[in-house]
């Protein structure tokens, strides 16, 4: 079953290569277990950036080596991606699945264009 997912159109990463955005889903029921996946689309290639599952009201659990962190509040997921560089600029798509209880719902956002600008190196100080 399909579900609507909303996310901001554009986000600019900080000078430290950190970008945050909210992924909001219109839950048709009372889901207790949710899976969130962030995918990057660039040059028609799609790659998985990170994925997490969480029980409603709890922290998102990403893999240990993940570049993502996040928190949830109701039907909103606050996602933060770290370690970004200019080459990581692209469309970051939020995918939400309501895993339990049945029925299973899937929603895919339109994507957030994240712009990353590498900081200029500091000039040498004499």
């Amino acid at each position: 079953k399909a579900m609507h997912v909303a996310q901001p159109a554009v986000v600019l990463a900080s000078s430290r290569g950190i970008a945050s955005f909210v992924c909001e889903y219109a839950s048709p029921g009372k889901a207790t277990e949710v899976r969130v996946t962030v995918l990057r689309q660039a040059d028609s290639q799609v790659t998985e950036v990170c994925a997490a599952t969480y029980m409603m009201g709890n922290e998102l659990t990403f893999l240990d080596d993940s570049i993502c962190t996040g928190t949830s509040s109701g039907n909103q997921v606050n996602l933060t991606i770290q370690g970004l560089r200019a080459m990581d600029t692209g469309l970051y798509i939020c995918k939400v699945e309501l895993m339990y209880p049945p029925p299973y719902y899937l929603g895919i956002g339109n994507g957030t264009q994240i712009y990353v600008i590498d900081p200029e190196p500091c000039p040498d100080s004499d």
């Epitope: 399909a2 996946t37 995918l39 689309q41 799609v46 790659t47 998985e48 994925a51 798509i93 995918k95 899937l106 895919i108």
Partner: nanobody
Framework: EVQLVESGGGLVQAGGSLRLSCAAS????????MGWFRQAPGKEQEFVAD????????YYADSVKGRFTISRDNAKNTVYLQMNSLKPEDTALYYC????????????WGQGTQVTVQS
């Protein structure tokens, strides 16, 4: 045209095992993910398990965790569901599904294979 064909369903006693297979045909492709869903008569569709190609990462519904194992053979474009310690409540029509890319949703579905567990 991609086709998914499930097999391996049947009638089994509670506590028994079955191994479901889902073979993809119709071309050479690399799926982002393949999974299993089930639907019992008069009930909503339920997610069972899936596996994502990128890291071979698996995910299971709590109701089957520790009893079911999903695996895939990329060379054969086939995904398997090993079901152990079956319970009467596992009785359902089991569907295989495949995702071409992570942002396409479940693009392809099989016709399903019936699993019946008798107590």
């Amino acid at each position: 045209e991609v086709q998914l064909v499930e097999s391996g369903g049947g009638l089994v006693q509670a506590g028994g095992s079955l191994r479901l297979s889902c073979a993809a045909s119709g071309g050479t492709f690399s799926f982002y993910g393949m999974g299993w869903f089930r639907q019992a008569p008069g009930k909503e569709q339920e997610f069972v398990a899936d596996i994502r190609t990128s890291a071979g990462r698996t995910y299971y519904a709590d109701s089957v965790k520790g009893r079911f194992t999903i695996s895939r053979d990329n060379a054969k474009n086939t995904v398997y569901l090993q079901m152990n310690s079956l319970k009467p409540e596992d009785t359902a029509l089991y569907y295989c599904a495949a995702e071409m890319s992570g942002i396409s949703g479940w693009d392809y579905w099989g016709q399903g294979t019936q699993v019946t567990v008798q107590s």
